[in-house]
Amino acid sequence: SCNTATCVTHRLAGLLSRSGGVVKDNFVPTNVGSEAF
C-alpha cells in the first residue's frame, strides 16, 4: 500500500473519522508510520 506522507495522512484521517476521534493523543501523521495501518 501507499506509504507516502500524504497517503499516511489521508489514511489516518479516515481512521479518525471512523473511530469518532477516540484515539491516543499522539496518533498523528508525523508520529504514525505506515506500519500502523
Epitope: 501507499c2 507516502t4 506522507a5 500524504t6 495522512t9 484521517a13 498523528v28 508525523t30
Partner: antibody, heavy 119, light 107 residues
C-alpha cells in the same frame, strides 16, 4: 483559523541562494507534514519535497536533491525551504502546503513567495 | 517519475455546462490522486483527494472518479466562479507529480 504565511518576494542573482519561510498557525505544527511546491511562469506545479516537522525527516524530488534544503524551527512553528546555486529557470512562485486533519480536514496552502533570479 | 497527462489543455464552456477533465497516470497510482483549482495570481485550492472525496466546503457540483491510471474531474453545472485552471496530482509515489493543467475559459 489555520494559516500558512510565507515570507516576501525575493530577487537573487544566478549562483546565489534563497531561503523562503512559512509560518504556521491555528494547528499543531509538529503533527503534520509540510510540503513545498513551486510554479514557474505559465508552467505546471512542481513538488520540491516534504518534511516531518516532528522528527525532521525529509523526502526530496531528485531534481532538487543537493540544491534544496528543508528545515523547521519547531519553537517558531516555521518551515523553511532553501534553494542554492540559483539559475534563471528557478524563477517561480514557491508555496508551502500542509494537509491538516484537526481542527479542519483540508489541504492548506501558503500565499506563495515569488523568487526572481536575474543578473 | 510518474507522468500525469491531463486533457484537454484548455476548453471553452458556458455557465451551466457539464465539464469533464481527464488525467492519465503513466503507471498505477491506485486512488491516490488529488485535484486542485487555481485562479490567476492565487494559490491552488484543493478540491478532491483519494480520487473521489471532496474536501469540506467544496461544492457538490465537483466530483472525481477513477482508479489505477485513469481519472476524471467533473463539474456538473459550471458556475461563473469555476473559470480557472485545474490540476491533477498523484501522491502514490515520490516524487509527487502534477498534470499540465486544464484551463476552463468562458465561451
Amino acid at each position: 483559523e489555520v494559516q500558512l504565511v510565507q515570507s516576501g518576494a525575493e530577487v537573487k542573482k544566478p549562483g546565489a541562494s534563497v531561503k523562503v519561510s512559512c509560518k504556521a498557525s491555528g494547528y499543531t505544527f509538529t503533527d503534520y507534514y509540510m510540503n513545498w511546491v513551486r510554479q514557474a511562469p505559465g508552467q505546471r506545479l512542481e513538488w520540491i519535497g516534504d518534511i516531518n516537522p516532528n522528527q525532521g525527516g525529509t523526502n526530496y524530488n531528485q531534481k532538487f536533491k543537493g540544491r534544496a534544503t528543508l528545515t523547521v524551527d519547531k519553537s517558531a512553528s516555521t518551515a523553511y525551504m532553501e534553494l542554492s546555486s540559483l539559475r534563471s529557470e528557478d524563477t517561480a512562485v514557491y508555496y508551502c502546503a500542509s494537509i491538516i486533519i484537526v481542527p479542519n480536514y483540508f489541504d492548506y496552502w501558503g500565499q506563495g513567495t515569488t523568487v526572481t533570479v536575474s543578473s | 517519475d510518474i507522468q500525469m497527462t491531463q486533457s484537454p489543455s484548455s476548453l471553452s464552456a458556458s455557465v451551466g455546462d457539464r465539464v469533464t477533465i481527464t488525467c492519465k497516470a503513466s503507471q498505477n497510482v491506485d486512488t491516490n490522486v488529488a485535484w486542485f483549482q487555481q485562479k490567476p495570481g492565487k494559490s491552488p485550492k484543493a478540491l478532491i483527494y483519494s480520487a473521489s472525496y471532496r474536501y469540506s466546503g467544496v461544492p457538490s457540483r465537483f466530483s472525481g472518479s477513477g482508479s489505477g491510471t485513469d481519472f476524471t474531474l467533473t463539474i456538473s453545472s459550471l458556475q461563473p466562479e469555476d473559470f480557472a485552471t485545474y490540476y491533477c496530482q498523484q501522491y502514490n509515489n515520490y516524487p509527487y507529480t502534477f498534470g499540465g493543467g486544464t484551463k476552463v475559459e468562458i465561451k
